[in-house]
Structure formats: structure tokens, C-alpha cells
Amino acid sequence: MKVLQEPTCVSDYMSISTCEWKMNGPTNCSTELRLLYQLVFLLSEAHTCIPENNGGAGCVCHLLMDDVVSADNYTLDLWAGQQLLWKGSFKPSEHVKPRAPGNLTVHTNVSDTLLLTWSNPYPPDNYLYNHLTYAVNIWSENDPADFRIYNVTYLEPSLRIAASTLKSGISYRARVRAWAQCYNTTWSEWSPSTKWHNSYREPFEQH
């Protein structure tokens, strides 16, 4: 049994890091493998992660972490029984994938303005709470070409757009994702999408 693709890990910079790897053949990850991880810090205990299958030869492990600070570094040992298959390390702050925003809501009752709001996925005491920026994706269910991205570079989790920038009388969907420049993170997954019917009063044409 050998590792074909070495583990790569990403952290949500809160409580979970996810590591994925591939074996050289079909593997029952949960019965055959264990991923041991330990913070390089005095008196930190080693923890064991039981991996799950992720495709035939792929494995994924969700490492639980009490908290994360930027200096943290973990040793990782992948074991098959008594055999050490791979040894490495992982610094969560250098491989951050933020949590996806939640509670995306479209408020359509504000005088021909669409107000989109969502929730920051981090608690106020987490470093990323004040460092997230967002991308909002809006698309038409009727017209695949009607697809747009709004970059929200301020901290407030909201976006205002004129309803008239979208077509009237048709349904739209929106979703939002996050990233943090300070840690050069990857983008989060998209939030679940929300749907609304766009309608607004056309201005009277003057002849």
C-alpha cells in the first residue's frame, strides 16, 4: 500500500482542517488508514483522524482543532496499521479556505432597489471576521448568458443594486462566497443560492 498523491490540507481558520490524498489503489480509508496530527507546541496532545473514502482510491480527513493562531504548525503522520506511509507538516494559516457565508436573503421591498444581505461565517473573536470580502453571483434562470459577479470589497455583508439593472418579470438566483486577502486565501465554497422574482416599475417614457 502506497500513497500516490500526498495529503494536501486546507483550514477554515476556526475549527476544521480538511486533508485529501490518493492511494495507489482502491482503499477502505476508514478501516485501513489513520492520520495522526499534533500541534508543534509544548504539552499539545496527538489526535487521530479516521479518514473517509473520497472516490475509489481517494481519502479525506476532517481534522478537529480547538482554535487556530497564525504561528500554528502541525505534524502529520499517515499510518496503515504499524506502517508509516507518509510524514509531513501543515501550517493552517498558509492554507486557508474560508467558511461559506450563510443566510443569503434578497430584500425586494426597498423602492426599486435590491438589497442582498448574508451572514459572516465567523464569530467576532475570530481574526477572519474583520478581513473577509465577498463576491456575489447573480444569474437568470431563463437566460444562461445573464450571469454577473459583483465584488464586495467593503466589510459589510450586504450589496445594493438597482432592480432595473436586471430584467423585469423574470426569476433570478443569487449566491455569495468569501475570501480574505490578509492570508491570501482561496475562495470559500458558494453559499446556498436564493431565488426571487424581479419586478419593478418601468419609468414612463416622455414623448
Epitope: 508543534v40 504539552l43 497564525s70 504561528a71
Partner: antibody, heavy 117, light 108 residues
Framework: QLQLVESGGGLVQPGGSLRLSCAAS????????MSWVRQAPGKGLEWVSG????????AYADSVKGRFTISRDNAKNTLYLQMNSLKPDDTAVYYC??????????WGQGTQVTVSS | QTVVTQEPSLSVSPGGTVTLTCGLS?????????PGWYQQTPGQAPRSLIY???SRHSGVPSRYSGSISGNKATLTITGAEPEDEADYYC????????FGGGTKLTVL
């Protein structure tokens, strides 16, 4: 409200023993690395010993190795320090500390240990 | 034997800014040393100010800030107040936890 209350200090003769206790409340004791830190009269702070959150790993300053034993009872939210073969140099205020350096740290008010004949 | 170095004493005028440093007798302080800062006033137990280089303990005023500058950890007090007069200790993760000798800060 978070609290750490040390007890068990006192006056002891050189070569004698004492057992310090630290009762914790107001936080999840079992999640914290715990330490004992001491301060001799008119001197600075010295880390003495520490124990992992689950109690499986311990560490000691060279000055107390082989004489002091740290332990914890997570069911009772209590930290202990068994001190044997005490020397006059061990005279100090002993503080119980939750979470040094890496997370928010909380200190007890301390208990006085005096080693004198 | 790891020795953590601090200025024995410093003074600052009320409203002024002062920077305390925390170094190693050999080598540089990095974030992997998780520098922490502790304040102690006479007759009181120490209290935590800064942990993991720059994170402020809850309840600590924003005039206290921690960082690493050059090869040392630093604690900066901006807009010093009379109640900031105290002993300040740094500690580093270096095999074990090692405290510095402390800095006596006078506000005058």
C-alpha cells in the same frame, strides 16, 4: 465568571513535602493546558511545570525535575502540584495558570510556599 | 540554556508611547515562539495582556499592542496612563515556557 483558586501552601521544613491544589470554575477546564508558575520574593516569574489538556503529557523546569509532580482531575476541575524534597530556593508564591502563550491566559491569585527550618 | 532578555527598567510620560522588547540571548524571536506579555502591579497576581505575538486578551485596552520587530517581540503602550506603571514580563515558547526577567515601567 472564570476563577482559579490555589490552596495548600504553607510553611514546610527543607526536605519536606506539600501538595498544592487549584480549583477551576467558569470555563472548560478540560480544554486547557495548565501550568504552575512561581515567583520568589522580589524576583521575576518562573515557569515550573505544565500538563496537557487530557493529562497525558507533562513537562517540568530543570530546577524541579524529579522532585515535583503535576497532575489534574478533569472530572473535579482541579490541578495539582505534588512537591517533594523541598529546598529553601523553592520559597515563592505559586500561581496556577490556564493557557499560557497560545491562547488567552488566566491566572489565579497564588498561594505562598515557604521552605525554612 | 535559553535566556529571555528584557530591559530592566523604562519610563514614559503620561500620554506618551513606550516600547518594551523581548529577545533571546542567542537567535531571533519569531511567531513560532508565541510571545506573550504579562502585567503585574505590586501585591497582585500577573494578568495576561497579549498572547501569540499580537492577540489582545479580552478586557485589555487597545493602547496595548504586540508585534515582532527585527529579532525581538515588542509590547507597545500608546498613550500611557498612570495605572500602566507596573512590572511587565514576556514569555516565549522555546522547548519549554521561558519568562524574561521583567521590565519595571515608570509613568512620570
Amino acid at each position: 465568571q472564570l476563577q482559579l483558586v490555589e490552596s495548600g501552601g504553607g510553611l514546610v521544613q527543607p526536605g519536606g513535602s506539600l501538595r498544592l491544589s487549584c480549583a477551576a470554575s467558569g470555563f472548560t477546564f478540560s480544554s486547557y493546558i495548565m501550568s504552575w508558575v512561581r515567583q520568589a520574593p522580589g524576583k521575576g516569574l518562573e515557569w515550573v511545570s505544565g500538563i496537557s489538556s487530557g493529562g497525558g503529557i507533562t513537562a517540568y523546569a530543570d530546577s524541579v525535575k524529579g522532585r515535583f509532580t503535576i497532575s489534574r482531575d478533569n472530572a473535579k476541575n482541579t490541578l495539582y502540584l505534588q512537591m517533594n524534597s523541598l529546598k529553601p530556593d523553592d520559597t515563592a508564591v505559586y500561581y496556577c495558570v490556564a493557557g499560557l502563550l497560545r491562547v488567552e491566559g488566566y491566572w489565579g491569585q497564588g498561594t505562598q510556599v515557604t521552605v525554612s527550618s | 540554556q535559553t535566556v529571555v532578555t528584557q530591559e530592566p527598567s523604562l519610563s514614559v510620560s503620561p500620554g506618551g508611547t513606550v516600547t518594551l522588547t523581548c529577545g533571546l540571548s542567542s537567535g531571533s524571536v519569531t511567531s513560532s515562539n508565541y510571545p506573550g506579555w504579562y502585567q503585574q502591579t505590586p501585591g497582585q497576581a500577573p494578568r495576561s495582556l497579549i498572547y501569540a505575538t499580537a492577540s489582545r486578551h479580552s478586557g485589555v485596552p487597545s493602547r496595548y499592542s504586540g508585534s515582532i520587530s527585527g529579532n525581538k517581540a515588542t509590547l507597545t503602550i500608546t498613550g500611557a496612563e498612570p495605572e500602566d506603571e507596573a512590572d511587565y514580563y514576556c514569555a516565549l515558547h522555546k522547548g519549554t515556557y521561558v519568562f524574561g526577567g521583567g521590565t519595571k515601567l515608570t509613568v512620570l
